[in-house]
């Protein structure tokens, strides 16, 4: 299972499509940023063996997508965008599953590291709390969109380190 | 935690088709595939298919290909299940399935079955 | 496609003996991917063990999953009353997605 290339490629997808999202200028939703704390030291790569990895990458697309599922989403998008970007989000989901299966010569491998798998949950929940807060008003939804974009580009840097390291 | 409740009883004659649904309600997501697994009297658990209700994507187990149809509205929340051309060995408890957003990792969530509804019974008869 | 076969069939066993059911794969399984499920009579199945060896909310420690590559094995420390049903193991395989039981084995009171 060629992970970094497959997924990279999908990852690059959905930055396209996610910048093609954007509605109103961020200039406008300045007085809306939000420091989220995206959990960077989970994807620094290195205490990361392949199947652990390949869990963490999981869980934040799986994240992503239920957020951007939600009916106050499919409110806020242009239809036919979230439509591929969640095509493309589920594409990559499935790709994950399949090198989980892949990987299954190395069995003994644990498939993650529980602190990270949260750290990942809780970024996310501090992103719907936030919409919550702000009661998913189109800047805060910009503001997400900005966020979510700038930690699928963290994490394909982690792909990237994970490509060298194979 | 996830409640599943699905359509009641049928009785159905051979050669026709019948269809089931199953509501989804409390921590619910578009974005986990809900399932459809039956169990015919006395007999073990059966997979039939699946729906992804976020993007209407189905995947069905190779014996019920062309005689099944899955769909889903988002909201609320329900799966279907359409099944054709019935046999007398149809005759089955239908169950509607889906995985647990709590499940960690998520890449096991969608493996498997954390909720279940109470089943729909389908008697097929002459 | 996989086919899962579980052993014994029915297992015959009096309240706080051990139990160890197997459930073979006719080709690798990712034990991340491996999952047991309890069915009592007139009930819908419940979660047991999820990859391969974690136990679900709320399921007693005397229930453990194990094993790797083909051979698989959910083990209950001592039977309580309530632990007597049936018993299934699942796969799950992908692309495409696909779900796979074992037969089941019957845990009975002797």
């Known amino acids: 299972c060629d992970l970094p290339q497959t997924h990279s490629l999908g990852n690059r997808r959905a930055l396209i499509l996610l910048a093609q999202m954007g509605r109103i200028s961020p200039f406008s939703c300045l007085k809306d940023r939000h420091d989220f704390g995206f959990p960077q030291e989970e994807f620094d790569g290195n205490q990361f063996q392949k199947a652990q990895a390949i869990s963490v990458l999981h869980e934040m697309i799986q994240q992503t997508f239920n957020l951007f599922s939600t009916k106050d989403s499919s409110a806020t998008w242009e239809q036919s965008l979230l439509e591929k970007f969640s095509t493309e989000l589920n594409q990559q989901l499935n790709d994950l599953e399949a090198c989980v299966i892949q990987e299954v010569g190395v069995e003994e491998t644990p498939l993650m590291n529980v602190d990270s798998i949260l750290a990942v949950k809780k970024y996310f929940q501090r992103i719907t709390l936030y919409l919550t807060e702000k009661k998913y008003s189109p800047c805060a939804w910009e503001v997400v969109r900005a966020e979510i974009m700038r930690s699928f580009s963290l994490s394909k840097i982690f792909q990237e380190r994970l490509r060298r390291k194979e | 935690e996830v409640q599943l409740l699905e359509s009641g009883a049928e009785v159905k004659r051979p050669g026709s088709s019948v269809r089931v649904s199953c509501r989804a309600s409390?921590?619910?997501?578009?974005?986990?595939?809900i399932s459809w697994v039956r169990q015919a009297p006395g007999q073990g658990l059966e997979w039939m298919g699946r729906?992804?209700?976020?993007?209407?994507?189905?995947n069905y187990a190779q014996n019920f290909r062309g005689r099944i149809t899955i769909t889903a509205d988002k909201s609320p929340l329900t799966a279907y299940l359409e099944l054709s051309s019935l046999r007398f060995e149809d005759t089955a408890v239908y169950y509607c399935?889906?995985?647990?957003?709590?499940?960690?990792?998520?890449?096991?969530?969608?493996?498997?079955?954390?909720?279940w509804g109470q089943g729909s019974l389908v008697t097929v008869s002459s | 496609e996989i086919v899962l076969t579980q052993s014994p069939g029915t297992l015959s066993l009096s309240p706080g003996e051990g139990a160890t059911l197997s459930c073979r794969a006719s080709?690798?399984?990712?034990?991340?991917?491996l999952t047991w499920y309890q069915q009592k009579p007139g009930q819908s199945p419940r979660l047991l063990i999820y990859g391969g060896s974690s136990r679900a909310t709320g399921v007693p420690d005397r229930f453990s999953g194990g094993g790797s590559g083909t051979d698989f094995t959910l083990t209950i420390s001592r039977l309580e009353p309530e632990d007597f049903a049936v018993f299934y193991c699942?796969?799950?395989?992908?692309?495409?997605?696909?779900?796979?039981f074992g037969q089941g084995t019957k845990v009975e009171i002797k």
């Open positions: 080709q690798n399984v990712s034990r991340h991917y």
């Open positions: 729906i992804l209700p976020a993007l209407g994507v189905t």
């Open positions: 409390g921590d619910t997501f578009s974005s986990y595939p």
């Open positions: 399935a889906s995985p647990s957003a709590d499940i960690i990792p998520s890449i096991l969530g969608t493996t498997l079955f954390a909720f």
């Open positions: 699942q796969s799950y395989h992908s692309p495409p997605p696909v779900y796979t």
